[in-house]
């Protein structure tokens, strides 16, 4: 759950308690079981860009 009083995440992103920040739903491609991915199921993700470390 997002901490009370914090701004909601922008469209195409979802709150991660594991990371304590909003995460881009496109990241669910890498790790579909990330905690924030549940919040992404309701809204379509932002356009995905392949990123390399």
């Amino acid at each position: 759950e997002q901490a009370p009083g914090t701004a909601p995440c922008s469209r195409g992103s979802s709150w991660s308690a594991d990371l304590d920040k909003c995460m881009d739903c496109a990241s669910c491609r890498a790790r579909p079981h990330s905690d924030f991915c549940l919040g992404c199921a309701a809204a379509p993700p932002a356009p995905f860009r392949l990123l390399w470390p």
């Epitope: 990371l19 304590d20 491609r29 890498a30 790790r31 579909p32 079981h33 990123l51 470390p53």
Partner: antibody
Amino acid sequence: QVQLVQSGAEVKKPGASVKISCKVSGYTFTDFIIAWVKQAPGKGLEWIGEIYPGTGRTYYSEKFRGKATLTADKSTSTAYMELSSLRSEDTAVYYCARRTIYYDYDGDYWGQGTTVTVSS
Amino acid sequence: DIVMTQSPLSLPVTPGEPASISCRSSKSLLHSSGITYLYWYLQKPGQSPQLLIYQMSNLASGVPDRFSSSGSGTDFTLKISRVEAEDVGVYYCAHNLELPWTFGGGTKVEIK
């Protein structure tokens, strides 16, 4: 470049504890998960658990819950795994591995491994 | 937990010849996104595991294109088109669909 450097080999007596470290460099420590994997002599790979270094949140394999404790020190970019109540079956090489949250592939960097030997 | 089963246990190979390793998962690794969360790792003698293939068919950075992988939701094959001496080691399949992260038992590839 990305590096995960683990602490040296340990020899412990049954019942003792051991704490091994994994110092990372070349990337932002809090941006990736650190997983720990066991490889017993002549055996395969077994996931122990993983930690989000930024928040300290952990996930464990049921098998290792109560055996392993994962922690992280953001100030030194170091992850730790403590193994308690050591038995002979804990003799193994233990690896830390960086697991991605952001990219399309996963587990792309591993430490060199730490050998733990439990012997009386 | 998802069980990953590999075969064969051991694979003697001739340099220059093709080789293939099979992996089966106890649950489909095909996600609703269309991505199949199957990974292949190689552990060379005395080394840490290294990623070869991610999401069933994508070569990791620096991996030669003689390696390829294909499959369905539960049955997968890693192919080496022409085995080289440097390809020896233990190959592991793994999934990244959910926790726990599980690996196959490994296939040891050795030169005949």
